[in-house]
């Protein structure tokens, strides 16, 4: 289907391929292979959903996600003395978010300019590979973090070097797995020139031949193996965690821990409901419809779901906040435009001068660099 009788190919609901080069003539462009999309697809590619809504969301994700994940990675690498497994998983989560978010200015420009990709084939492949890589990395590291949180409640043993090494090993295995499963996204030609719209799309229009069966099988496999199975593990870990916390003794400290655990569970649940479930479900439905009907009627929903999946880069910092004392302190102080060092100095001076209760309670509310995992 890549090359029809007349060496031409058609897209179906943003699917299809021009297999060949194009060259500019006096007026317009002459393409060696005909490529056309259906009218609905064309309306999506030229409509406000992709040219206004998407860039707005991606701008928010970039503006929030870049500094918060950047700070998180810095805190976990350089400001956390004990590298607990949770810290290791969160550092990887932050790294995955950063690797995806750094490409967003190109993605924003692409959508603002009417879904016209001008940055070349290689950059498009990198952007798409990192886009999906981030989503599946986030799911897997979130699963590891969730299982680890439950493990800490069941076995509240001290930090051991062995546990940290296991966490590092698991993290490396996850990166390797994601690299392997996203290889098809790097290998496949992702850019395509659509003569009717005079635009070159990146990933929005894909080779028909590939899509009919392969894309459906690919995303179905990912949805089962890298979404459903980890989601089941995460849910199980949190259900067991809630049971454990309910049955445990209720002193002031454990009540605080319980509240934070519930906040963490709600955050992760929100992430699954907003980011991971809609995108994975619609990826499968979208490609199933293309496979069976030749066009997808859920394209608009699919595009919104994929867009919302990037919000995980904004939600992840809340996870860090509820899990890590160090990140919590740095986040609070960053928002109050203070450094932890300044707060420590304030604390020392306030303690030595034996200030009023109000002052000391104020200073203590935003300090402490101790960690409890």
């Amino acid at each position: 289907t890549i090359q029809g009788t007349n060496r031409s190919s058609k897209g179906r609901s943003l699917i299809g391929k021009v297999d060949g080069t194009s060259h500019v003539t006096g007026k317009g462009v002459t393409v060696e292979t005909v490529f056309s999309v259906d009218e609905f697809s064309a309306s999506v590619l030229t409509g406000k959903l992709t040219t206004v809504f998407l860039p707005i969301v991606y701008t928010i994700v970039f503006v929030v996600g870049l500094p918060s994940n950047g700070m998180a990675l810095w805190v976990f690498l350089f400001r956390t003395k004990k590298k607990h497994p949770a810290v290791i998983y969160m550092a990887n989560l932050a790294l995955a978010d950063l690797l995806s978010v750094i490409w967003f200015p190109l993605k924003i420009a692409y959508h603002i300019h009417g879904n016209n990709w001008i940055y070349g084939e290689a950059l498009c492949n990198v952007l798409i590979g990192f886009f999906y890589g981030n989503m599946y990395c986030s799911i897997l590291f979130m699963t590891c973090l969730s299982v680890q949180r439950y493990w800490v409640i069941v076995n509240p043993m001290g930090h051991s070097r062995k546990k940290a090494n296991i966490a590092i090993g698991i993290s490396l295995a996850i990166w390797l797995l994601i690299l392997l499963v996203t290889i098809p996204l790097y290998v496949v030609k992702q850019t395509i020139f659509i003569p009717a719209l005079n635009i070159t799309t990146c990933h929005d229009v894909l080779p028909e031949q590939l899509l009919v069966g392969d894309m459906f099988n690919y995303f179905l496999s990912l949805a089962i193996g890298v979404f459903l199975f980890p989601a089941f593990l995460t849910a199980s870990a949190y259900v067991l965690m809630i049971r454990m916390l309910r049955s445990s003794a209720m002193d002031e400290n454990s009540e605080k821990k319980r509240k934070r655990a519930i906040k963490l569970i709600v955050t992760v649940l929100a992430m699954y409901l907003i980011c991971f479930t809609p995108s994975n479900l619609l990826l499968v439905v979208h490609y199933f419809l293309i496979k069976s009907q030749g066009q997808s009627h859920v394209y608009a929903l699919y595009i919104v779901a994929l867009c919302l999946s990037t919000l995980n880069s904004c939600i992840d910092p809340f996870v860090y906040y509820f899990v890590s004392h160090d990140f919590r302190d740095h986040a609070k102080n960053a928002l109050l435009c203070r450094s932890v060092r300044t707060v420590k100095q304030m604390q020392v001076s306030l303690t030595s001068k034996k200030h009023s209760r109000k002052s000391s309670s104020y200073s203590s509310s935003s300090t402490t660099v101790k960690t409890s995992y």
Partner: antibody
Framework: QVQLKESGPGLVQPSQTLSLTCSVS????????VIWVRQPPGKGLEWMGV???????AYNFTLKSRLTISRDTSKSQVFLKMNNLQTEDTAMYFC?????????????WGQGVMVTVSS | DIQMTQSPSFLSASVGDRVTINCKAS??????LDWYQQKLGEAPKLLIY???SLHTGIPSRFSGSGSGTDFTLTISSLQPEDVATYFC????????FGGGTKLELK
Amino acid sequence: QVQLKESGPGLVQPSQTLSLTCSVSGFSLSSYGVIWVRQPPGKGLEWMGVVWGNGNTAYNFTLKSRLTISRDTSKSQVFLKMNNLQTEDTAMYFCGRWRGFKDYPFDYWGQGVMVTVSS
Amino acid sequence: DIQMTQSPSFLSASVGDRVTINCKASQNIYKYLDWYQQKLGEAPKLLIYNTNSLHTGIPSRFSGSGSGTDFTLTISSLQPEDVATYFCLQHNSGWTFGGGTKLELK
């Protein structure tokens, strides 16, 4: 109403260039594409090429090296130029209107012009 | 490359007859098949597009069905003015025409 009309020489010498014009009315060439199709005597139809509403063009792979499609939107005319004609290029040549999208058919066609390649 | 096989090549029927013309694609073309009517010395005329959608001004006796690889044009009650050559066109991947069916009156 929508109308397309092909015009050009009925007889062309082998190795010469064929020039055909498709004059349209009832629609804008900026909004619609125009396709060229030919039908050799007693044979089936063959798609030749297309010019989109934005001026982009594409050609049948087998004719690509000999074919050029252009247009003049102000005159509502589309032109087909094919060089190095051979006797097997003898056919009825049609132009048709196309919206430019995959799910649209060639909804209106011209009457066609018979071109004979002979010395 | 998608090949379109149209059958029969010739068809003779009487006025009032139910006539069916078939078109078979070499691979799945989903719904992207159109039917055209061409009378001698006239421009081809669109009858049915996207398998079963009737073009404006076309009598309701013409109908289309099928999906995937097998498609059918049906004339429920043949009229004298329906004498013509009918051909199918796939536009799922490029454009390929069927060989045509010449319909005449008995």
